[in-house]
Interface confidence: low
């Protein structure tokens, strides 16, 4: 129940040993009491004891003092428990009876006779202080005291507030006198079920399951969980968010392991060639005429530049070359002609125009042909017109540059941001990298473009390989694999040295 009405009988006096009807008890009045507690009535009436009733064994004969007794038969004070909100008012009827029968259970004996009764009506607040009273009539006097107290775990002015101290996963608290919770040290919250983490523990990146600890969420480290963990394998980079690898100045590639200033740092291009910080190795050498090789380290044949015009054939000599001219041509490069338009010197549909009063001529070549006599098919890629590692392709009368990812323009001369077209779905963060854009996905999404919604407990299926540890994120729908030494990849599936696939968060 929520409370107890307690009645302490102190002394009963019936000096003449008389009953209410005027008769006397023989040999004396063997006295027990019946108590009836009910709701407040201005005029006390018979009827059920709505708040409870109790009887005592025989407590004495005629006049006697009632001693306190805490257990067993004849317990004093008498206890009338109730399990409702105490209303603050009551009616109490105390009857003294004489029994000729059993001392312990006089209630059941026949022939019981009323000695006297008192009725008390009034208000009574819950509290520990006893209210003492004494009632007299012509024959008897009764001294008693009474109070209402709350049962264990009940509190408040009407014992209506239930509070049971606890120290388990549902809460860590004691109860205040008014029934409100008082959190144990290190705990907070309405139900004192939220631990107070280590002072300074990062609010978002750290948490605790017991007081004074700071457990880092995946991707964070440090005593206060305020340092992000960069992506596994990040060489020359840092992070501002977990699993990021933001490259230091001059470094590129997924793991910031490609030197973007290779030309300056290493001067790899030989023989006066031009170095540009591009291409699959981080640099490209553009050779001067007469040289070839990755670093322009190889000298070409002197005839390699095709110096002989008008179909002349080139012969290498010690430090030079010699042109053997076809009939009708002369000069060091066979550049002079002895022919006229009458000799039909223009090939491939070229049209002939006379010059110098018909002593010489010039050929006007159709598209795709060149040379003094339109004898050469045009290769528009010989001048290496495509910048930034673009690939030159002859397309009929013109040529096109096929650009590497991240470049555009007729000659691939313009660098574009892959992130400009917002490729990342569901609020993913885009990063421009050498090999294209990369998305960092928010919790609950994955895929190259954060297009996949994850709806299961991601670690339950054991997605991490090679002994890696799986961590779920802020929600159970994303996971991060913490790879052991020697393995990389979002699931730690690749030994170091093999190319991992990229998703930041699986």
């Amino acid at each position: 129940g929520s409370g107890i009405f307690q009645l302490r009988l102190q002394e009963f006096v019936n000096q003449r040993g008389m009953l209410a009807n005027g008769q006397s008890c023989e040999p004396g009045c063997r006295t027990f009491f019946r108590i009836c507690l009910k709701h407040f009535q201005a005029t006390f009436s018979e009827g059920p004891c709505t708040f409870g009733n109790v009887s005592t064994p025989v407590l004495g004969t005629n006049s006697f003092v009632v001693r306190d007794k805490n257990s067993g038969s004849g317990r004093n004070p008498l206890q009338l428990p109730f399990n409702f909100t105490w209303p603050g008012t009551f009616s109490l009827n105390i009857q003294a009876w004489h029994t000729p029968g059993d001392d312990l259970r006089p209630e059941t004996s026949p022939g019981n006779s009323l000695i006297s009764q008192i009725i008390i009506q009034g208000s009574l607040a819950v509290g520990k202080i006893w209210r003492t009273d004494e009632q007299n009539d012509t024959l008897t006097r009764l001294s008693y005291s009474y109070r209402v107290i709350c049962s264990d775990n009940y509190y408040g002015e009407s014992c209506s507030r239930l509070c049971k101290k606890r120290d388990d996963h549902f809460g860590h608290y004691e109860c205040q006198p008014d029934g409100s919770l008082s959190c144990l040290p290190g705990w907070t919250g309405k139900y004192c079920d939220q631990p107070i983490c280590l002072s300074g523990c990062h609010e978002q990146n750290g948490y605790c399951s017991k007081p004074d600890e700071c457990i880092c969420r995946p991707g964070w480290q440090g005593r206060l969980c305020n340092e992000c963990i960069p992506h596994n394998g990040c060489r020359h980079g840092t992070c501002s968010i977990p699993w990021q690898c933001a490259c230091d100045e001059g470094w590129g590639g997924l793991f910031c392991d490609q030197d973007l200033n290779y030309c300056t740092h290493h001067s790899p291009c030989k023989n006066g060639s031009t170095c540009s910080n591009s291409g699959p190795k981080g640099y490209t050498c553009t050779c001067l005429p007469g040289y070839t090789g990755e670093h322009c380290e190889l000298g070409l044949s002197k005839c390699a530049s095709n110096p002989c015009r008008n179909g002349g054939s080139c012969k290498d000599q010690e430090n030079s070359y010699h042109c053997l001219c076809p009939p009708g041509y002369y000069g060091q490069h066979c550049e002079h002609s002895t022919l006229t338009c009458a000799d039909s010197p223009c090939f491939n549909g070229g049209s002939c125009r006379e010059r110098n009063q018909g002593s010489s001529y010039a050929c006007e070549c159709p598209p795709n042909f060149t040379g003094s006599n339109c004898e050469k098919k045009v290769d528009r890629c010989t001048s290496n017109p495509c910048a930034n590692g673009g690939q030159c392709q002859n397309r009929g009368p013109s040529r096109t540059c096929r650009c590497r990812p991240g470049f555009t323009g007729t000659h691939c001369e313009l660098h574009i941001s892959d992130c400009a077209r917002s490729p990342c779905a569901h609020g993913g963060t885009c990063h421009d990298l050498e090999n294209g854009p990369v998305c960092t996905c928010p919790a609950g999404f994955s895929g190259r473009r954060c297009e996949v919604r994850i709806t299961h407990d991601a670690c339950a299926s054991g997605p991490c390989f090679n002994g890696a540890t799986c961590y779920t994120g802020l929600s159970p729908n994303n996971f991060v694999c913490n790879c052991p030494y020697g393995f990389v990849g979002s699931r730690c599936e690749f030994p170091v040295g093999l190319p991992p696939s990229f998703p930041w968060v699986a």
């Epitope: 549902f170 809460g171 309405k190 139900y191 079920d193 159970p476």
Partner: nanobody
Framework: EVQLVESGGGLVQPGGSLRLSCAAS????????IGWFRQAPGKEPEEISC????????YYADSVKGRFTISRDNAKNTVYLQMNSLKPEDTAVYYC?????????????TGQGTQVTVSS
């Protein structure tokens, strides 16, 4: 008015099964966690199981772990307690309760209870 009504109790032999239901009304059911506790005569109430508003978080007391399963059907405003491998010590009055919030914290409303007796 919030109401929780338990049903499904009864007499069952040791090793048998029962499925208790708790039908709720008077509040937005899928906003609240719902739990079960039991009380045997003369004993303290014992928390058995609880399920969060979303159904994503469930709690089981050690004494019933692996034998009892809690679930909820938000469309029917009902929580179920499937009790398998019942033992005599599972005999008690079973009550369903809600803390009146989404997580399993404390008790705000309870039902009238349903008696489960496990005896041969």
């Amino acid at each position: 008015e919030v109401q929780l009504v338990e049903s499904g109790g009864g007499l069952v032999q040791p090793g048998g099964s029962l499925r208790l239901s708790c039908a709720a009304s008077g509040f937005t059911f899928d906003d609240y966690a719902i739990g079960w506790f039991r009380q045997a005569p003369g004993k303290e109430p014992e928390e058995i199981s609880c399920i969060s508003s979303s159904g994503g978080i469930t709690y089981y007391a050690d004494s019933v772990k692996g034998r009892f399963t809690i679930s909820r059907d938000n469309a029917k405003n009902t929580v179920y307690l499937q009790m398998n491998s019942l033992k005599p010590e599972d005999t008690a009055v079973y009550y369903c309760a809600t803390p009146g919030i989404a997580a399993c914290r404390g008790i705000h409303y309870t039902g009238q209870g349903t008696q489960v007796t496990v005896s041969s």
